[in-house]
Interface confidence: low
């Protein structure tokens, strides 16, 4: 669910959203660190219905979600796979 990408491409995100996306609507999250041609960190959320949203890295909800996913990925707990975007 949580993926970090280093890419030679420039910034991917033209517009960022801070609107909350429930986790069960999310297929995976890409984190593009600052550098490699882009001056800012980018977070790309891939929804289960195949749409893609760029999320503001400063949005509190995405920071909390990533922290939860990091903790779970470092433990034995499986991370739920949300295949459909529903509450």
């Amino acid at each position: 669910v949580l993926e970090v990408y280093y890419t030679s491409l420039r910034c991917r995100c033209v517009q960022e959203s801070s609107v909350f996306i429930p986790r069960r609507f999310i297929d995976r999250i890409q984190i593009l660190p600052r550098g490699n041609g882009c001056p800012r960190k980018e977070i790309i959320v891939w929804k289960k219905n195949k749409s893609i949203v760029c999320v503001d890295p400063q949005a509190e909800w995405i920071q909390r979600m990533m922290e939860v996913l990091r903790k779970r990925s470092s433990s034995t707990l499986p991370v739920p796979v949300f295949k459909r975007k529903i509450p």
């Epitope: 429930p22 069960r24 529903i86 509450p87």
Partner: antibody
């Protein structure tokens, strides 16, 4: 005050297409980070989630019924629709629409319509 | 699909009794479980969301517990107005409901 009201044909014949409407007020689907779902309940007790549409217009379906379902909303942001093709007697049920309000850490089905009864019969 | 197994399907208890209803998920759903009450002829009403959070306006005699695959709804002191059917709902992956528990007063 959030209210939802379902409407439909009441009775229709097998193999036809069922069209349902959910009319709502008290919230804006397009701006409130909300999701409207369709759920049905057969004559027993079971509840079955069918489909949903969210504030961005994204659509979601129950995988087991996906090929027969189409969910949509109107541009005036006061109605959500569900179409079920090739209906069968097994589609006889009470159909509910429900709104899910998204909060920072969860999403909850927090308001339901009263439901509309649909009978499929020849 | 995640399957929710709810038990018992029928429950008869006395006013004042402590009542428990169980839901078991076919796989780990973490805390993504809600409980609903449905009275005859009415739409379901949310009681508990995300395992143990009491929905606004719901009496404190209702509580929820559990995690992972096993969850419980508890009514600490059964009241006549609690006669209804109770459903669990998992919202970890898509949405699936339990089969319901019909609660009556004996």
């Amino acid at each position: 005050h959030v209210t939802l009201r379902e409407s439909g044909p009441g009775v229709l014949q097998p193999s036809k297409t069922l069209s349902l409407t959910c009319s709502f007020s008290g919230f804006s689907l397009s701006t409130s980070a909300m999701v409207v779902s369709w759920i049905r309940q057969s004559s027993g007790m079971s509840l079955e989630w069918l489909a949903a549409i969210d504030w961005e217009g994204d659509k979601y379906y129950n995988p087991s019924l996906e090929s027969r379902l189409t969910v949509s909303r109107d541009i005036s942001d006061t109605q959500v629709f569900l179409r079920i093709t090739s209906v069968d007697v097994a589609d006889t049920a009470t159909y509910y629409c429900a709104v899910m309000s998204s909060a920072d850490s969860h999403s909850v089905l927090d308001a339901w319509g009263q439901g509309v009864s649909v009978t499929v019969s020849s | 699909d995640i399957k929710m197994t709810q038990s018992p399907s029928f429950l008869s208890a006395s006013v004042g009794d402590r009542v428990t209803i169980n839901c078991k998920a076919s796989q780990n759903i973490h805390n993504y479980l809600n409980w609903y009450q449905q009275k005859f002829g009415e739409a379901p009403r949310l009681l508990i969301y995300n395992t143990n959070n009491l929905q606004t306006g719901i009496p404190s005699r209702f509580s929820g517990s559990g995690s992972g695959t096993d969850f419980t709804l508890t009514i600490s002191s059964l009241q006549p107005e609690d006669v209804a059917t109770y459903f669990c709902l998992q919202h970890s992956s898509s949405l699936t409901f339990g089969s319901g528990t019909k609660l009556e007063i004996n």
